[in-house]
């Protein structure tokens, strides 16, 4: 994995220490030849939780185009999920305009949908380079 990235189960992870909107975080990861993190299992969830710190953190899951989709094409319906109770709820009461179309880890690791423009921390994920 690149310097300052962490390895887990054949993937490399980078944990931000500041905040960006979901689109900006998505763009950042792509420029690093990576994508916002996709959570495939309880074990991967625990790894991410352990390293991210107890703050809201964007992941690569959004329903901006309709149904919930992972940014790498992983099937949402059959895949791992870890939503907080009563989430996602597409809440409109925040006053920022629109609903809630982007998913993030909350303090305890469970997921919530929120307004995509909130500047939260984020996690990038990339496949490990087999040559390293």
């Amino acid at each position: 994995c690149p310097v300052n990235w962490l390895e887990y189960e054949g993937s490399c992870y980078w944990f931000s220490r500041s905040g960006k909107s979901w689109p900006e975080a998505d763009k950042y990861c792509q420029l690093e030849s990576a994508h916002l993190v996709v959570v495939n299992s309880r074990e991967e969830q625990k790894f991410i939780q352990h390293h991210m710190g107890p703050v809201n953190t964007w992941m690569g899951l959004t329903d901006q185009s309709g149904p919930w989709k992972w940014v790498d094409g992983t099937d949402y319906e059959t895949g791992f999920k870890n939503w907080r109770p009563e989430q996602p709820d597409d809440w409109y009461g925040h006053g920022l305009g629109g609903g809630e179309d982007c998913a993030h880890f909350t303090d305890d690791g469970r997921w919530n949908d929120d307004v995509c423009q909130r500047p939260y921390r984020w996690v990038c994920e990339a496949a490990r380079d087999p040559a390293t």
């Epitope: 905040g19 009461g93 920022l96 909350t106 303090d107 305890d108 500047p119």
Partner: antibody, heavy 121, light 112 residues
Framework: QVQLVESGGGVVQPGRSLRLSCAAS????????MHWVRQAPGKGLEWVAI????????YYADSVKGRFTISRDNSKNTLYLQMSSLRAEDTAVYYC??????????????WGQGALVTVSS | DIVMTQTPLSLSVTPGQPASISCKSS???????????LYWYLQKPGQPPQLLIY???NRFSGVPDRFSGSGSGTDFTLKISRVEAEDVGIYYC?????????FGQGTRVEIK
């Protein structure tokens, strides 16, 4: 240490314009959301506006929407509030305030000392 | 907009005695992320407000432990276990779950 210093306050006639500035130091200004909050003489606190760390999003209280514009110059570590079509009810001390964290926190941890704006003919 | 209602609006306290301020919101302040976006500020005479408590019950750095916050949903309380002379000023609750951020009317605390 975090320092926020407002300037540009003064007496202005109704209908005229005024621009407030807030010079920031002691932290990485470009990483933080910033707000303006005002307090009319002898009254309570009223949130006025917020601007995202990179200036990409701005939101306003209904009472100032369409008349006030919040902006920032990250190269100068400065926050601005352009106030136009001023009314007597805009008379207040205007505080600039910084988000608590360099990610969404939802509250202000640091405040300036305030700039008094008096709208009077 | 969310309306924040504080009671009482004024409080006169003997030094060393406890004080309690109530704050009620017109809507729940519990967010989908599990946090409750309720804050307490103190504005001392001639000064800008200063943060005391964030997210209902967390003391901001440097805030004495005689200050404590509690509550959930729409009902919140700020308690001062033993009031000191330096605690005089106006206390405000604030919500930030919804734009616009809104404050309570303020509670003036004075020393008897």
């Amino acid at each position: 240490q975090v320092q926020l210093v407002e300037s540009g306050g003064g007496v202005v006639q109704p209908g005229r314009s005024l621009r407030l500035s807030c010079a920031a130091s002691g932290f990485t200004f470009s990483s933080y959301g910033m707000h303006w909050v005002r307090q009319a003489p002898g009254k309570g606190l009223e949130w006025v506006a917020i601007i995202w760390y990179d200036g990409s999003y701005k939101y306003y209280a209904d009472s100032v929407k369409g008349r006030f514009t919040i902006s920032r110059d990250n190269s100068k570590n400065t926050l601005y509030l352009q106030m136009s079509s001023l009314r007597a009810e805009d008379t207040a001390v205007y505080y600039c305030a910084r988000d608590a964290h360099d990610f969404w926190s939802g509250y202000f941890a640091y405040w300036g000392q305030g700039a008094l704006v008096t709208v009077s003919s | 907009d969310i309306v924040m209602t504080q009671t009482p609006l004024s409080l006169s306290v003997t030094p060393g005695q406890p004080a309690s301020i109530s704050c009620k919101s017109s809507q729940s302040l519990l967010h989908g992320d599990g946090k409750t976006y309720l804050y307490w500020y103190l504005q001392k005479p001639g000064q800008p407000p200063q943060l005391l408590i964030y997210e209902v019950s967390n003391r901001f750095s440097g805030v004495p432990d005689r200050f404590s916050g509690s509550g959930s949903g729409t009902d919140f309380t700020l308690k001062i276990s033993r009031v000191e002379a330096e605690d005089v000023g106006i206390y405000y609750c604030m919500q930030s779950i919804q734009i616009p951020w809104t404050f309570g009317q303020g509670t003036r605390v004075e020393i008897k």
